[in-house]
């Protein structure tokens, strides 16, 4: 039985240079306890884009529009979108420990950059 | 209409055991998080334990930690709670209580009276 | 663990006045832009029953006269008009991810 589902709705987003990209993800439960990141790319290369405990993000904000009850916005919105930023982005739970460990990953959603 | 319905409780003696048990209908048992929360005159409300909606991950604070164990049977719709070495302070009343987030409690059951003493 | 300051402890209110609670976290319950606190009702007799889930969302079925505020560590549960079936005991209760889930001490709501 899944314990919780990790929803990305988008395949693919497409954004002008310059502006900002809203990277949608919603959760089903908050169990297992634990914290939710963000990462483009995957496998152990891949570059951590948010985490809500530690780190400095300055393009990153959150932008739940959380108001269902059996679900849980996690979306992020990444400002002055740039080339270099296309990518394919997935928001993955994780489950608390030492060190956390991963969970379940969102399916991902494919960034791509138009020109202004 | 969702029911949560304990049963189980009573008086037992310091050191002694009891198991807590809720039987849930009205809703898809086995898609929700649950939990049991006790109450008392002096401390309120207290968590004591949950459980995931697959019944692979559970969560006590230390209160309770090593000697409760909550697990489900999805099967029969059913949570329970075994309650080891109980102590006075483990007098209560104890309410299941289901979550379909794991977040907020939405719905509670009547409660379940639990009295340990000599 | 969070502690949960609520206060006050009972509150007398006339009936259609504003009956105000509030409850303040020793930390931050937030994550990703959403306050993890959470408001009850019991009365006498009865199991608590789910009012505002994560701080401002109203739960199906409760009266709109209920509202929730708040982010990070302060919140308050509001009830305006305060009615007589409104009379009874209120916890708010945060589920962050620091356990343990911890509640406030209630707040006993009176009509003066």
């Known amino acids: 039985e899944e314990e919780l589902q990790v929803i990305q709705p988008d395949k693919s987003v497409s954004v002008a240079a310059g502006e900002s990209a809203i990277l949608h993800c919603t959760v089903t439960s908050l169990i297992p306890v634990g914290p939710i990141q963000w990462f483009r790319g995957a496998g152990p290369a891949r570059e951590l884009i948010y985490n809500q405990k530690e780190g400095h993000f300055p393009r990153v904000t959150t932008v739940s529009e959380s108001t269902k009850r059996e679900n849980m916005d996690f979306s992020i919105s990444i400002s002055n979108i740039t080339p270099a930023d296309a990518g394919t982005y997935y928001c993955v739970k994780f489950r608390k420990g030492s060190p956390d460990t991963e969970f379940k990953s969102g399916a991902g959603t494919e960034l791509s950059v138009r020109a202004k | 209409e969702v029911q949560l319905v304990e049963s189980g409780g009573g008086l037992v003696k310091p050191g002694g055991s009891l198991r807590l048990s809720c039987a849930a209908s009205?809703?898809?048992?086995?898609?929700?998080?649950m939990s049991w929360v006790r109450q008392t005159p002096g401390k309120g409300l207290e968590w004591v334990a949950t459980?995931?909606?697959?019944?692979?991950?559970?969560y006590y604070p230390d209160s309770v930690k090593g000697r409760f164990t909550l697990s489900r049977d999805n099967a029969k719709n059913s949570l329970y709670l075994q309650m080891n070495s109980l102590r006075a302070e483990d007098t209560a009343v104890y309410y299941c209580?289901?979550?379909?987030?794991?977040?907020?409690?939405?719905?509670w059951g009547q409660g379940t009276t639990v009295t340990v003493s000599s | 663990d969070i502690v949960i300051t609520q206060s006050p402890a009972s509150l007398a209110v006339s009936l259609g006045e504003r009956a105000t609670i509030s409850c303040r976290a020793s930390?931050?319950?937030?994550?990703?832009?959403?306050?993890?606190m959470h408001w009850y009702q019991q009365k006498p007799g009865q199991p608590p029953k789910l009012l505002i889930y994560?701080?401002?969302n109203l739960e199906s079925g409760v009266p709109d006269r209920f509202s929730g505020s708040g982010s990070r560590t302060d919140f308050t549960l509001t009830i305006n008009p305060l009615q007589a079936e409104d009379v009874a005991t209120y916890y708010c209760?945060?589920?962050?991810?620091?356990?343990?889930?911890?509640f406030g001490g209630g707040t006993k709501v009176e009509i003066k």
């Open positions: 209580a289901s979550s379909v987030d794991g977040s907020a409690f939405d719905y």
């Open positions: 009205g809703f898809t048992f086995s898609s929700y998080v």
């Open positions: 459980i995931s909606s697959g019944g692979t991950y559970t």
């Open positions: 930390e931050s319950v937030d994550s990703y832009g959403m306050s993890f």
């Open positions: 994560r701080a401002s």
């Open positions: 209760h945060q589920s962050s991810e620091n356990l343990p889930w911890t």
